[in-house]
């Protein structure tokens, strides 16, 4: 996702995941100083943040996802112990101080572990 | 019913300056995301800049960034966007239209009729 | 940034025919975050169909969308006189937005 200003990767744009698991949405950006990076979630429930930080700094984790998300310098987040209801639709905007931003989605399936998989 | 009217399209010279405005009633205003989209003549439509409900998150396309400025006035339910350095190939009807929330996603339910920016000597 | 290319550039039908325009996406990601719009001469375009297969309020329901990976789909079942346009996608997966370049639905 090229700008002038801001250039945001998301190599994986779509995750499957079972419950319990440790989910990474991974992407990659590079820009001009030190931007702001917000995650939120979104789905037929409604949008809500999830955290918003810049690299360095503490994060802005907010209630509903705290103890449950952590996040790294180069715009990441993992999720822990993932359920069913955090299926849906993760979109990061990357903000440079200047203003310029970027955003790109990562949709996330999580589904139950059927007895029968496990045989 | 949602309504859109654009104004302050018009002729300009090459490196001219216009600033565009839209002024939204029949819904409330903060809770969405506008855009400005543009056509030029015979042409497709070009995304051109979005601004969400509150006014704090912008992005711009790449052949209008650090010559267009998109911003909002909440209080008159008007939505604008500043022209600077144009060039020929700026010319084109320029819609604004309304977002489905505050912010993404970014697709867009109600038009604007457009108003005609000419870049021309 | 996603180019999103519509095929065919023009599309000849008679009215009560069945049309069916693509959108392809440059790359994956898009998934469920398509868009379809029409615009007639002189108009604004109108929201048909979001997310891909959702129908906008007051859509009937001759217009879906579809989708198969990277490959979008509008279909209109019986074209109706007032369905002749053209028709453009947009993709909201990532910024910088985009329109595809639109397909045109003339009469035949």
């Known amino acids: 996702l090229q700008s002038q200003g801001v250039s945001l990767y998301i190599p994986q744009a779509t995750i499957n995941a079972t419950v319990k698991e440790d989910i990474l949405l991974s992407v990659e950006y590079s820009c001009h100083g030190v931007p702001t990076i917000e995650w939120t979630y979104s789905s037929n429930w409604g949008t809500q943040k999830i955290v918003e930080w810049k690299p360095g700094t503490q994060a802005n984790i907010s209630q509903s996802h705290k103890d449950r998300v952590c996040t790294f310098d180069n715009g990441s987040i993992q999720l822990f112990s993932v359920g069913v209801r955090d299926s849906g639709y993760y979109v990061i905007t990357v903000t440079e101080r200047l203003g310029s931003s970027q955003f790109g989605t990562i949709v996330l399936h999580v589904s139950e572990i059927l007895y029968e998989d496990l045989h | 019913e949602v309504q859109l009217v654009e104004s302050g399209g018009g002729l300009v010279q090459p490196g001219g300056s216009l600033r565009l405005s839209c002024a939204a009633s029949?819904?409330?205003?903060?809770?969405?995301?506008m855009t400005w989209v543009r056509q030029a003549p015979g042409k497709g439509l070009e995304w051109v800049s979005v601004?969400?409900?509150?006014?704090?998150?912008?992005y711009y396309a790449d052949s209008v960034k650090g010559r267009f400025t998109i911003s909002r006035d909440n209080s008159k339910n008007t939505l604008y966007l500043q022209m600077s350095s144009l060039r020929a190939e700026d010319t084109a009807v320029y819609y604004c239209?309304?977002?489905?929330?505050?912010?993404?996603?970014?697709?867009?339910?109600?038009w604007g009729q457009g108003t005609l920016v000419t870049v021309s000597s | 940034e996603i180019v999103l290319t519509q095929s065919p550039g023009t599309l000849s039908l008679s009215p009560g025919e069945r049309a069916t325009l693509s959108c392809r996406a440059s790359q994956s990601g898009v998934t469920n975050f398509l868009a379809w719009y029409q615009q007639k001469p002189g108009q604004a375009p109108r929201l048909l169909i979001y997310?891909?297969?959702s129908r906008a309020t007051g859509i009937p329901d001759r217009f879906s969308g579809s989708a198969s990976g990277t490959d979008f789909t509008l279909t209109i079942t019986r074209l109706e006189p007032e369905d002749f346009a053209v028709y453009f996608c947009?993709?909201?997966?990532?910024?910088?937005?985009?329109f595809g370049g639109g397909t045109k639905v003339e009469i035949k």
């Open positions: 947009q993709q909201y997966a990532s910024s910088p937005l985009t």
């Open positions: 239209a309304k977002g489905y929330s505050s912010g993404w996603p970014y697709y867009f339910d109600y």
């Open positions: 029949g819904f409330t205003f903060s809770s969405y995301a």
């Open positions: 997310a891909t297969s």
């Open positions: 601004i969400s409900g509150g006014g704090g998150t912008t």
